[in-house]
Protein backbone atom coordinates (compact mmCIF):
# COMPACT_ATOMS: atom_id res chain seq x y z
CA UNK A 1 0.00 0.00 0.00
CA UNK A 2 1.22 3.48 -0.88
CA UNK A 3 0.90 6.04 1.92
CA UNK A 4 -1.68 8.78 1.36
CA UNK A 5 0.13 12.11 0.88
CA UNK A 6 -0.94 15.41 -0.64
CA UNK A 7 0.09 16.10 -4.23
CA UNK A 8 2.88 18.72 -4.44
CA UNK A 9 1.90 22.01 -6.00
CA UNK A 10 1.91 22.00 -9.81
CA UNK A 11 2.25 18.22 -10.08
CA UNK A 12 -1.40 17.28 -10.47
CA UNK A 13 -1.67 15.18 -13.65
CA UNK A 14 -3.92 16.72 -16.32
CA UNK A 15 -3.39 13.75 -18.63
CA UNK A 16 -1.53 10.48 -18.76
CA UNK A 17 1.75 11.26 -20.50
CA UNK A 18 5.49 10.58 -20.43
CA UNK A 19 6.14 13.18 -17.73
CA UNK A 20 4.69 10.68 -15.24
CA UNK A 21 7.66 8.32 -15.55
CA UNK A 22 9.63 10.82 -13.44
CA UNK A 23 7.07 10.69 -10.62
CA UNK A 24 7.93 8.76 -7.50
CA UNK A 25 5.46 6.11 -6.42
CA UNK A 26 3.90 8.32 -3.77
CA UNK A 27 3.57 11.17 -6.27
CA UNK A 28 1.72 8.92 -8.72
CA UNK A 29 -0.60 7.88 -5.93
CA UNK A 30 -1.23 11.46 -4.86
CA UNK A 31 -1.28 13.23 -8.21
CA UNK A 32 -2.95 10.91 -10.70
CA UNK A 33 -6.72 10.83 -10.53
CA UNK A 34 -8.08 7.28 -10.86
CA UNK A 35 -10.94 8.40 -13.10
CA UNK A 36 -8.47 10.13 -15.44
CA UNK A 37 -6.37 6.98 -15.53
CA UNK A 38 -9.43 4.89 -16.38
CA UNK A 39 -10.39 7.10 -19.31
CA UNK A 40 -6.84 7.26 -20.66
CA UNK A 41 -5.76 3.63 -20.11
CA UNK A 42 -4.86 3.31 -23.80
CA UNK A 43 -1.94 5.71 -23.20
CA UNK A 44 -0.35 3.71 -20.39
CA UNK A 45 1.20 1.14 -22.72
CA UNK A 46 3.04 3.77 -24.72
CA UNK A 47 4.79 4.99 -21.58
CA UNK A 48 7.78 3.05 -20.14
CA UNK A 49 6.55 2.83 -16.55
CA UNK A 50 8.53 0.70 -14.11
CA UNK A 51 6.94 -2.36 -12.51
CA UNK A 52 6.71 -0.43 -9.26
CA UNK A 53 4.88 2.43 -10.97
CA UNK A 54 2.49 -0.03 -12.64
CA UNK A 55 1.73 -1.41 -9.17
CA UNK A 56 0.59 2.05 -8.11
CA UNK A 57 -1.59 2.47 -11.20
CA UNK A 58 -3.19 -0.91 -10.57
CA UNK A 59 -3.82 0.07 -6.95
CA UNK A 60 -5.61 3.22 -8.11
CA UNK A 61 -7.85 1.24 -10.46
CA UNK A 62 -8.59 -1.30 -7.72
CA UNK A 63 -9.75 1.50 -5.44
CA UNK A 64 -11.92 3.01 -8.17
CA UNK A 65 -13.46 -0.33 -9.16
CA UNK A 66 -13.53 -2.59 -6.08
CA UNK A 67 -16.18 -4.84 -7.71
CA UNK A 68 -14.07 -5.34 -10.84
CA UNK A 69 -13.00 -3.22 -13.81
CA UNK A 70 -15.45 -2.30 -16.57
CA UNK A 71 -14.71 -3.69 -20.02
CA UNK A 72 -13.78 -0.23 -21.36
CA UNK A 73 -10.81 -0.28 -18.97
CA UNK A 74 -10.00 -3.98 -19.36
CA UNK A 75 -9.68 -3.66 -23.13
CA UNK A 76 -6.86 -1.12 -22.74
CA UNK A 77 -4.98 -2.68 -19.82
CA UNK A 78 -2.09 -3.81 -21.99
CA UNK A 79 0.95 -4.70 -19.90
CA UNK A 80 -0.94 -3.82 -16.74
CA UNK A 81 -2.79 -7.12 -17.35
CA UNK A 82 0.40 -8.95 -16.30
CA UNK A 83 -0.03 -7.38 -12.85
CA UNK A 84 -3.51 -8.85 -12.38
CA UNK A 85 -4.12 -11.90 -10.24
CA UNK A 86 -6.64 -14.64 -11.07
CA UNK A 87 -8.71 -13.27 -8.16
CA UNK A 88 -8.81 -9.83 -9.84
CA UNK A 89 -9.85 -11.36 -13.15
CA UNK A 90 -12.67 -13.41 -11.60
CA UNK A 91 -14.41 -10.08 -10.86
CA UNK A 92 -14.46 -9.11 -14.54
CA UNK A 93 -17.20 -9.52 -17.10
CA UNK A 94 -15.45 -9.77 -20.47
CA UNK A 95 -17.85 -10.13 -23.42
CA UNK A 96 -15.96 -8.65 -26.36
CA UNK A 97 -13.70 -10.86 -28.46
CA UNK A 98 -11.61 -7.75 -29.18
CA UNK A 99 -10.93 -7.36 -25.46
CA UNK A 100 -9.91 -11.00 -25.21
CA UNK A 101 -7.57 -10.66 -28.21
CA UNK A 102 -5.99 -7.50 -26.79
CA UNK A 103 -5.15 -9.22 -23.50
CA UNK A 104 -3.95 -12.45 -25.13
CA UNK A 105 -1.63 -10.34 -27.27
CA UNK A 106 0.08 -9.07 -24.10
CA UNK A 107 0.93 -12.66 -23.09
CA UNK A 108 1.82 -13.79 -26.63
CA UNK A 109 4.78 -16.16 -26.91
CA UNK A 110 4.52 -17.30 -23.31
CA UNK A 111 2.84 -20.38 -21.89
CA UNK A 112 -0.72 -19.98 -20.68
CA UNK A 113 -0.50 -18.28 -17.29
CA UNK A 114 -3.06 -18.74 -14.49
CA UNK A 115 -4.24 -15.21 -15.32
CA UNK A 116 -4.85 -16.06 -18.97
CA UNK A 117 -6.53 -19.35 -18.05
CA UNK A 118 -8.90 -17.47 -15.71
CA UNK A 119 -9.58 -14.81 -18.34
CA UNK A 120 -10.47 -17.44 -20.97
CA UNK A 121 -12.62 -19.33 -18.49
CA UNK A 122 -14.55 -16.15 -17.61
CA UNK A 123 -14.98 -15.27 -21.28
CA UNK A 124 -16.19 -18.71 -22.39
CA UNK A 125 -18.54 -19.08 -19.41
CA UNK A 126 -19.95 -15.64 -20.18
CA UNK A 127 -20.69 -16.69 -23.76
CA UNK A 128 -22.20 -19.99 -22.67
CA UNK A 129 -20.38 -22.00 -25.32
CA UNK A 130 -17.12 -22.14 -27.23
CA UNK A 131 -18.19 -20.60 -30.55
CA UNK A 132 -16.14 -20.74 -33.74
CA UNK A 133 -14.73 -17.19 -33.53
CA UNK A 134 -13.60 -17.72 -29.93
CA UNK A 135 -12.06 -21.08 -30.78
CA UNK A 136 -10.29 -19.55 -33.78
CA UNK A 137 -8.82 -16.86 -31.55
CA UNK A 138 -7.81 -19.13 -28.70
CA UNK A 139 -6.17 -21.82 -30.83
CA UNK A 140 -4.28 -19.13 -32.77
CA UNK A 141 -2.67 -17.96 -29.52
CA UNK A 142 -2.52 -21.39 -27.82
CA UNK A 143 -2.55 -24.37 -30.20
CA UNK A 144 -2.91 -26.72 -27.22
CA UNK A 145 -5.91 -24.88 -25.81
CA UNK A 146 -8.57 -27.35 -26.86
CA UNK A 147 -6.71 -30.24 -25.25
CA UNK A 148 -6.39 -28.31 -21.99
CA UNK A 149 -10.17 -28.49 -21.52
CA UNK A 150 -11.88 -31.24 -19.60
CA UNK A 151 -14.31 -33.56 -21.43
CA UNK A 152 -17.11 -31.74 -19.59
CA UNK A 153 -15.94 -28.36 -20.89
CA UNK A 154 -15.53 -29.74 -24.41
CA UNK A 155 -19.14 -30.85 -24.39
CA UNK A 156 -20.13 -27.17 -24.72
CA UNK A 157 -18.33 -26.91 -28.08
CA UNK A 158 -21.01 -26.77 -30.82
CA UNK A 159 -20.34 -28.91 -33.92
CA UNK A 160 -20.16 -25.74 -36.04
CA UNK A 161 -17.03 -24.68 -34.11
CA UNK A 162 -15.20 -27.84 -35.16
CA UNK A 163 -14.48 -26.22 -38.53
CA UNK A 164 -12.03 -23.93 -36.75
CA UNK A 165 -9.96 -26.82 -35.37
CA UNK A 166 -6.62 -27.56 -37.04
CA UNK A 167 -4.84 -30.94 -36.74
CA UNK A 168 -2.12 -29.46 -34.52
CA UNK A 169 -4.77 -28.23 -32.09
CA UNK A 170 -5.50 -31.86 -31.21
CA UNK A 171 -1.90 -33.05 -30.79
CA UNK A 172 -2.04 -33.32 -27.01
CA UNK A 173 -5.65 -34.47 -26.62
CA UNK A 174 -6.17 -37.71 -24.73
CA UNK A 175 -8.77 -40.41 -25.58
CA UNK A 176 -11.43 -38.98 -23.24
CA UNK A 177 -11.24 -35.62 -25.00
CA UNK A 178 -11.35 -37.15 -28.48
CA UNK A 179 -14.33 -39.27 -27.40
CA UNK A 180 -16.21 -35.98 -26.95
CA UNK A 181 -14.87 -34.21 -30.03
CA UNK A 182 -15.19 -37.03 -32.58
CA UNK A 183 -19.04 -37.19 -32.67
CA UNK A 184 -19.12 -33.41 -33.07
CA UNK A 185 -16.65 -33.60 -35.96
CA UNK A 186 -18.62 -36.42 -37.57
CA UNK A 187 -21.73 -34.24 -37.42
CA UNK A 188 -19.92 -31.14 -38.67
CA UNK A 189 -18.40 -32.87 -41.70
CA UNK A 190 -21.27 -35.25 -42.52
CA UNK A 191 -22.16 -33.60 -45.83
CA UNK A 192 -18.66 -33.84 -47.30
CA UNK A 193 -17.75 -36.47 -49.88
CA UNK A 194 -15.51 -39.48 -49.08
CA UNK A 195 -11.97 -38.21 -49.64
CA UNK A 196 -12.67 -34.67 -48.37
CA UNK A 197 -14.44 -36.10 -45.34
CA UNK A 198 -11.45 -38.27 -44.47
CA UNK A 199 -9.05 -35.33 -44.69
CA UNK A 200 -11.18 -33.37 -42.21
CA UNK A 201 -12.09 -36.21 -39.82
CA UNK A 202 -8.61 -37.77 -39.73
CA UNK A 203 -7.27 -35.82 -36.77
CA UNK A 204 -10.39 -36.63 -34.71
CA UNK A 205 -10.28 -40.40 -35.31
CA UNK A 206 -8.78 -41.06 -31.87
CA UNK A 207 -12.39 -40.98 -30.70
CA UNK A 208 -13.86 -43.19 -33.43
CA UNK A 209 -15.66 -46.46 -32.62
CA UNK A 210 -14.95 -49.77 -34.37
CA UNK A 211 -17.94 -49.54 -36.73
CA UNK A 212 -16.72 -46.21 -38.13
CA UNK A 213 -13.23 -47.63 -38.71
CA UNK A 214 -14.76 -50.63 -40.46
CA UNK A 215 -16.75 -48.26 -42.69
CA UNK A 216 -13.60 -46.25 -43.50
CA UNK A 217 -11.78 -49.46 -44.43
CA UNK A 218 -14.24 -49.89 -47.29
CA UNK A 219 -13.41 -46.44 -48.73
CA UNK A 220 -9.75 -46.77 -49.81
CA UNK A 221 -8.66 -44.01 -47.42
CA UNK A 222 -5.01 -45.13 -46.98
CA UNK A 223 -4.75 -44.05 -43.36
CA UNK A 224 -1.18 -43.24 -42.33
CA UNK A 225 0.48 -45.01 -39.41
CA UNK A 226 0.59 -41.87 -37.26
CA UNK A 227 -3.22 -41.70 -37.40
CA UNK A 228 -3.60 -45.44 -36.82
CA UNK A 229 -1.41 -45.21 -33.71
CA UNK A 230 -3.80 -42.64 -32.24
CA UNK A 231 -6.87 -44.84 -32.58
CA UNK A 232 -8.63 -46.15 -29.49
CA UNK A 233 -7.34 -49.58 -28.47
CA UNK A 234 -10.87 -50.90 -27.94
CA UNK A 235 -11.84 -49.70 -31.41
CA UNK A 236 -8.84 -51.35 -33.10
CA UNK A 237 -8.99 -54.77 -31.40
CA UNK A 238 -12.09 -56.09 -33.24
CA UNK A 239 -10.72 -55.16 -36.68
CA UNK A 240 -9.75 -58.13 -38.83
CA UNK A 241 -6.39 -58.36 -40.59
CA UNK A 242 -8.19 -57.77 -43.89
CA UNK A 243 -9.88 -54.63 -42.53
CA UNK A 244 -6.63 -53.20 -41.21
CA UNK A 245 -4.96 -53.94 -44.54
CA UNK A 246 -7.72 -52.05 -46.39
CA UNK A 247 -7.70 -49.21 -43.88
CA UNK A 248 -3.96 -48.63 -44.15
CA UNK A 249 -3.54 -49.48 -47.83
CA UNK A 250 0.12 -49.02 -48.80
CA UNK A 251 0.93 -47.89 -45.25
CA UNK A 252 0.29 -51.40 -43.87
CA UNK A 253 4.03 -52.11 -44.05
CA UNK A 254 4.49 -49.57 -41.26
CA UNK A 255 2.93 -52.01 -38.79
CA UNK A 256 6.25 -53.83 -38.53
CA UNK A 257 8.04 -50.76 -37.12
CA UNK A 258 5.26 -50.28 -34.57
CA UNK A 259 4.74 -53.92 -33.53
CA UNK A 260 6.01 -53.31 -29.99
CA UNK A 261 3.82 -50.26 -29.46
CA UNK A 262 0.18 -49.81 -28.56
CA UNK A 263 -2.35 -50.18 -30.05
CA UNK A 264 -0.57 -52.22 -32.76
CA UNK A 265 0.86 -54.67 -30.20
CA UNK A 266 -2.57 -55.22 -28.62
CA UNK A 267 -4.12 -55.83 -32.02
CA UNK A 268 -1.41 -58.24 -33.23
CA UNK A 269 -1.68 -60.31 -30.07
CA UNK A 270 -5.37 -60.97 -30.72
CA UNK A 271 -5.08 -62.05 -34.37
CA UNK A 272 -4.68 -65.57 -35.73
CA UNK A 273 -1.09 -66.17 -36.83
CA UNK A 274 -2.29 -67.49 -40.19
CA UNK A 275 -4.09 -64.19 -40.83
CA UNK A 276 -1.06 -62.11 -39.81
CA UNK A 277 1.13 -64.16 -42.14
CA UNK A 278 -0.98 -63.03 -45.12
CA UNK A 279 0.49 -59.53 -44.63
CA UNK A 280 3.99 -60.89 -45.23
CA UNK A 281 5.49 -58.59 -42.61
CA UNK A 282 6.76 -61.20 -40.16
CA UNK A 283 4.39 -60.07 -37.40
CA UNK A 284 4.26 -62.52 -34.49
CA UNK A 285 1.04 -62.90 -32.48
Amino acid sequence: EVEKTACPSGKKAREIDESLIFYKKWELEACVDAALLATQMDRVNAIPFTYEQLDVLKHKLDELYPQGYPESVIQHLGYLFLKMSPEDIRKWNVTSLETLKALLEVNKGHEMSPQVATLIDRFVKGRGQLDKDTLDTLTAFYPGYLCSLSPEELSSVPPSSIWAVRPQDLDTCDPRQLDVLYPKARLAFQNMNGSEYFVKIQSFLGGAPTEDLKALSQQNVSMDLATFMKLRTDAVLPLTVAEVQKLLGPHVEGLKAEERHRPVRDWILRQRQDDLDTLGLGLQG
Epitope: T233, R260, R262, L269, G285
Partner: antibody, heavy 119, light 107 residues
Framework: QVQLQESGPGLVKPSETLSLTCTVS??????????WSWIRQPPGKGLEWIGY???????NYNPSLKSRVTISVDTSKNQFSLKLSSVTAADTAVYYC???????????WGQGTMVTVSS | DIQMTQSPSSLSASVGDRVTITCRAS??????VNWYQQKPGKAPKLLIY???SLQSGVPSRFSGSGSGTDFTLTISSLQPEDFATYYC?????????FGGGTKVEIK
Amino acid sequence: QVQLQESGPGLVKPSETLSLTCTVSGGSVSSYHDLWSWIRQPPGKGLEWIGYIYYSGSTNYNPSLKSRVTISVDTSKNQFSLKLSSVTAADTAVYYCARDFVLSGFDIWGQGTMVTVSS
Amino acid sequence: DIQMTQSPSSLSASVGDRVTITCRASQSSRYYVNWYQQKPGKAPKLLIYAASSLQSGVPSRFSGSGSGTDFTLTISSLQPEDFATYYCQQSYDASYTFGGGTKVEIK
Protein backbone atom coordinates in the same frame (compact mmCIF):
# COMPACT_ATOMS: atom_id res chain seq x y z
CA GLN B 1 -14.95 -60.36 -8.92
CA VAL B 2 -11.61 -61.61 -10.29
CA GLN B 3 -9.04 -62.55 -7.66
CA LEU B 4 -5.42 -63.68 -8.00
CA GLN B 5 -3.43 -65.89 -5.63
CA GLU B 6 0.30 -66.61 -5.87
CA SER B 7 1.73 -69.89 -4.59
CA GLY B 8 5.15 -71.51 -4.49
CA PRO B 9 8.19 -72.01 -2.26
CA GLY B 10 9.32 -69.08 -0.15
CA LEU B 11 12.96 -70.18 -0.14
CA VAL B 12 15.08 -71.07 -3.17
CA LYS B 13 18.79 -71.95 -3.26
CA PRO B 14 21.21 -69.93 -5.41
CA SER B 15 21.63 -71.24 -8.98
CA GLU B 16 18.31 -73.12 -8.75
CA THR B 17 15.01 -72.29 -10.48
CA LEU B 18 12.31 -70.23 -8.82
CA SER B 19 8.81 -71.51 -9.66
CA LEU B 20 5.57 -69.72 -8.83
CA THR B 21 1.96 -70.21 -9.88
CA CYS B 22 -0.89 -67.71 -9.98
CA THR B 23 -4.43 -69.03 -9.73
CA VAL B 24 -7.22 -66.93 -11.24
CA SER B 25 -10.63 -67.16 -9.57
CA GLY B 26 -13.88 -65.37 -10.37
CA GLY B 27 -12.86 -64.97 -14.00
CA SER B 28 -11.10 -66.71 -16.86
CA VAL B 29 -7.44 -66.72 -17.80
CA SER B 30 -8.73 -67.04 -21.39
CA SER B 31 -10.29 -63.56 -21.33
CA TYR B 32 -9.97 -61.74 -24.66
CA HIS B 33 -9.03 -58.41 -23.10
CA ASP B 34 -6.53 -59.53 -20.47
CA LEU B 35 -2.82 -60.16 -20.26
CA TRP B 36 -1.35 -61.86 -17.20
CA SER B 37 1.82 -60.43 -15.72
CA TRP B 38 4.45 -61.12 -13.11
CA ILE B 39 5.96 -58.17 -11.24
CA ARG B 40 8.48 -58.20 -8.42
CA GLN B 41 9.68 -55.87 -5.70
CA PRO B 42 12.97 -56.38 -3.85
CA PRO B 43 12.84 -55.41 -0.14
CA GLY B 44 12.74 -51.60 0.21
CA LYS B 45 12.93 -51.07 -3.53
CA GLY B 46 10.62 -50.24 -6.43
CA LEU B 47 8.52 -52.36 -8.79
CA GLU B 48 10.01 -54.34 -11.67
CA TRP B 49 7.90 -55.88 -14.43
CA ILE B 50 9.05 -59.43 -15.29
CA GLY B 51 6.81 -60.36 -18.21
CA TYR B 52 3.31 -61.19 -19.42
CA ILE B 53 1.43 -63.97 -21.19
CA TYR B 54 -1.77 -64.04 -23.25
CA TYR B 55 -4.04 -67.07 -23.10
CA SER B 56 -2.92 -68.02 -26.62
CA GLY B 57 0.55 -68.60 -25.18
CA SER B 58 2.14 -65.43 -26.58
CA THR B 59 4.66 -63.99 -24.14
CA ASN B 60 6.74 -60.88 -23.68
CA TYR B 61 9.58 -60.54 -21.18
CA ASN B 62 11.65 -57.81 -19.56
CA PRO B 63 14.84 -57.70 -21.70
CA SER B 64 17.02 -57.69 -18.57
CA LEU B 65 15.54 -61.03 -17.43
CA LYS B 66 14.62 -62.59 -20.77
CA SER B 67 17.35 -65.23 -20.82
CA ARG B 68 16.22 -66.65 -17.46
CA VAL B 69 12.42 -66.25 -17.59
CA THR B 70 9.65 -68.55 -18.78
CA ILE B 71 5.97 -67.71 -18.29
CA SER B 72 3.37 -70.33 -19.21
CA VAL B 73 -0.41 -70.62 -19.03
CA ASP B 74 -2.68 -73.56 -18.23
CA THR B 75 -6.18 -72.65 -19.36
CA SER B 76 -7.65 -75.90 -18.01
CA LYS B 77 -6.51 -75.03 -14.48
CA ASN B 78 -7.09 -71.29 -14.91
CA GLN B 79 -3.50 -70.64 -13.89
CA PHE B 80 -0.34 -69.05 -15.20
CA SER B 81 3.18 -69.70 -13.95
CA LEU B 82 6.61 -68.14 -13.65
CA LYS B 83 9.98 -69.88 -13.83
CA LEU B 84 13.16 -67.92 -13.16
CA SER B 85 16.37 -69.91 -13.58
CA SER B 86 19.86 -69.48 -12.14
CA VAL B 87 18.69 -67.32 -9.26
CA THR B 88 20.97 -65.25 -7.05
CA ALA B 89 20.43 -63.20 -3.88
CA ALA B 90 19.49 -60.26 -6.17
CA ASP B 91 16.29 -62.16 -7.09
CA THR B 92 15.05 -62.01 -3.49
CA ALA B 93 11.79 -60.09 -3.67
CA VAL B 94 8.05 -60.06 -3.20
CA TYR B 95 6.59 -61.56 -6.39
CA TYR B 96 3.17 -60.38 -7.54
CA CYS B 97 0.93 -61.69 -10.28
CA ALA B 98 -1.38 -59.12 -11.85
CA ARG B 99 -4.05 -58.77 -14.50
CA ASP B 100 -3.22 -56.30 -17.24
CA PHE B 101 -6.58 -55.16 -18.62
CA VAL B 102 -6.00 -53.86 -22.15
CA LEU B 103 -8.05 -50.70 -21.60
CA SER B 104 -6.47 -49.66 -18.30
CA GLY B 105 -3.46 -51.24 -16.59
CA PHE B 106 -2.63 -53.61 -13.75
CA ASP B 107 -6.07 -53.35 -12.23
CA ILE B 108 -6.05 -56.57 -10.16
CA TRP B 109 -3.10 -57.86 -8.14
CA GLY B 110 -2.36 -60.89 -6.04
CA GLN B 111 -1.37 -60.19 -2.44
CA GLY B 112 2.26 -61.06 -3.26
CA THR B 113 4.56 -63.84 -2.07
CA MET B 114 7.99 -63.32 -0.58
CA VAL B 115 10.74 -65.41 -2.17
CA THR B 116 14.16 -65.49 -0.54
CA VAL B 117 17.20 -66.78 -2.39
CA SER B 118 19.63 -68.21 0.15
CA SER B 119 21.64 -71.34 0.73
CA ASP C 1 13.41 -49.53 -23.12
CA ILE C 2 11.57 -46.41 -22.04
CA GLN C 3 12.96 -45.14 -18.73
CA MET C 4 10.49 -43.51 -16.36
CA THR C 5 12.00 -40.90 -14.02
CA GLN C 6 9.84 -39.87 -11.09
CA SER C 7 10.29 -36.77 -8.97
CA PRO C 8 10.55 -36.08 -6.18
CA SER C 9 11.65 -39.42 -4.71
CA SER C 10 10.03 -38.38 -1.44
CA LEU C 11 8.07 -35.46 -0.05
CA SER C 12 6.59 -34.35 3.24
CA ALA C 13 3.12 -32.86 3.26
CA SER C 14 0.24 -32.11 5.59
CA VAL C 15 -3.38 -33.19 5.45
CA GLY C 16 -5.24 -30.82 3.11
CA ASP C 17 -2.17 -30.00 1.02
CA ARG C 18 -2.18 -30.15 -2.76
CA VAL C 19 0.47 -32.66 -3.85
CA THR C 20 1.97 -33.00 -7.33
CA ILE C 21 4.20 -35.86 -8.48
CA THR C 22 5.82 -35.84 -11.90
CA CYS C 23 7.02 -38.59 -14.17
CA ARG C 24 9.22 -38.09 -17.23
CA ALA C 25 9.58 -40.72 -19.94
CA SER C 26 12.89 -41.04 -21.82
CA GLN C 27 10.87 -41.13 -25.06
CA SER C 28 7.25 -40.60 -25.94
CA SER C 29 4.79 -42.92 -24.22
CA ARG C 30 1.84 -41.17 -25.90
CA TYR C 31 -0.85 -41.29 -23.18
CA TYR C 32 -0.14 -44.88 -22.09
CA VAL C 33 0.91 -44.07 -18.54
CA ASN C 34 -0.68 -45.42 -15.37
CA TRP C 35 -0.31 -44.41 -11.72
CA TYR C 36 -0.37 -46.73 -8.69
CA GLN C 37 -0.51 -46.27 -4.93
CA GLN C 38 1.23 -48.74 -2.61
CA LYS C 39 1.04 -48.95 1.15
CA PRO C 40 3.57 -50.92 3.23
CA GLY C 41 3.05 -54.68 3.04
CA LYS C 42 0.28 -54.35 0.44
CA ALA C 43 0.03 -54.85 -3.31
CA PRO C 44 -0.08 -51.70 -5.46
CA LYS C 45 -3.47 -50.25 -6.40
CA LEU C 46 -4.31 -48.72 -9.79
CA LEU C 47 -5.35 -45.04 -9.46
CA ILE C 48 -5.10 -43.51 -12.93
CA TYR C 49 -4.85 -45.16 -16.34
CA ALA C 50 -4.25 -43.75 -19.82
CA ALA C 51 -2.64 -40.67 -18.23
CA SER C 52 -5.85 -39.05 -17.05
CA SER C 53 -8.66 -41.59 -16.57
CA LEU C 54 -9.71 -42.26 -12.99
CA GLN C 55 -9.96 -45.94 -12.09
CA SER C 56 -13.36 -46.97 -10.78
CA GLY C 57 -13.68 -46.52 -7.01
CA VAL C 58 -10.75 -44.09 -6.71
CA PRO C 59 -11.58 -40.76 -5.00
CA SER C 60 -11.88 -37.75 -7.32
CA ARG C 61 -9.16 -35.87 -5.41
CA PHE C 62 -6.72 -37.93 -7.52
CA SER C 63 -6.15 -36.70 -11.06
CA GLY C 64 -3.62 -37.31 -13.79
CA SER C 65 -2.49 -35.29 -16.78
CA GLY C 66 0.12 -35.24 -19.49
CA SER C 67 1.04 -36.88 -22.77
CA GLY C 68 4.22 -37.64 -24.67
CA THR C 69 7.04 -37.50 -22.15
CA ASP C 70 5.72 -35.49 -19.20
CA PHE C 71 3.06 -36.77 -16.82
CA THR C 72 1.65 -35.55 -13.52
CA LEU C 73 -0.30 -37.11 -10.66
CA THR C 74 -2.10 -34.58 -8.48
CA ILE C 75 -3.80 -35.10 -5.13
CA SER C 76 -5.95 -32.00 -4.69
CA SER C 77 -6.37 -32.27 -0.92
CA LEU C 78 -4.22 -34.84 0.84
CA GLN C 79 -6.08 -37.16 3.22
CA PRO C 80 -4.59 -39.27 6.05
CA GLU C 81 -5.08 -42.46 4.01
CA ASP C 82 -3.07 -41.01 1.07
CA PHE C 83 0.29 -41.30 2.82
CA ALA C 84 1.91 -44.02 0.69
CA THR C 85 4.34 -44.60 -2.17
CA TYR C 86 3.22 -43.73 -5.71
CA TYR C 87 4.53 -45.26 -8.93
CA CYS C 88 4.08 -44.34 -12.59
CA GLN C 89 4.26 -47.02 -15.29
CA GLN C 90 4.33 -46.89 -19.08
CA SER C 91 2.67 -49.52 -21.23
CA TYR C 92 3.20 -47.94 -24.66
CA ASP C 93 6.29 -50.02 -25.35
CA ALA C 94 6.08 -53.80 -24.99
CA SER C 95 8.74 -53.71 -22.27
CA TYR C 96 6.73 -52.18 -19.45
CA THR C 97 8.66 -49.98 -17.05
CA PHE C 98 7.90 -48.34 -13.70
CA GLY C 99 9.16 -45.10 -12.23
CA GLY C 100 11.32 -45.33 -9.10
CA GLY C 101 8.48 -44.28 -6.81
CA THR C 102 7.59 -41.23 -4.72
CA LYS C 103 7.09 -41.66 -0.99
CA VAL C 104 4.55 -39.22 0.45
CA GLU C 105 5.17 -38.78 4.17
CA ILE C 106 3.47 -36.82 6.93
CA LYS C 107 5.09 -33.46 7.65
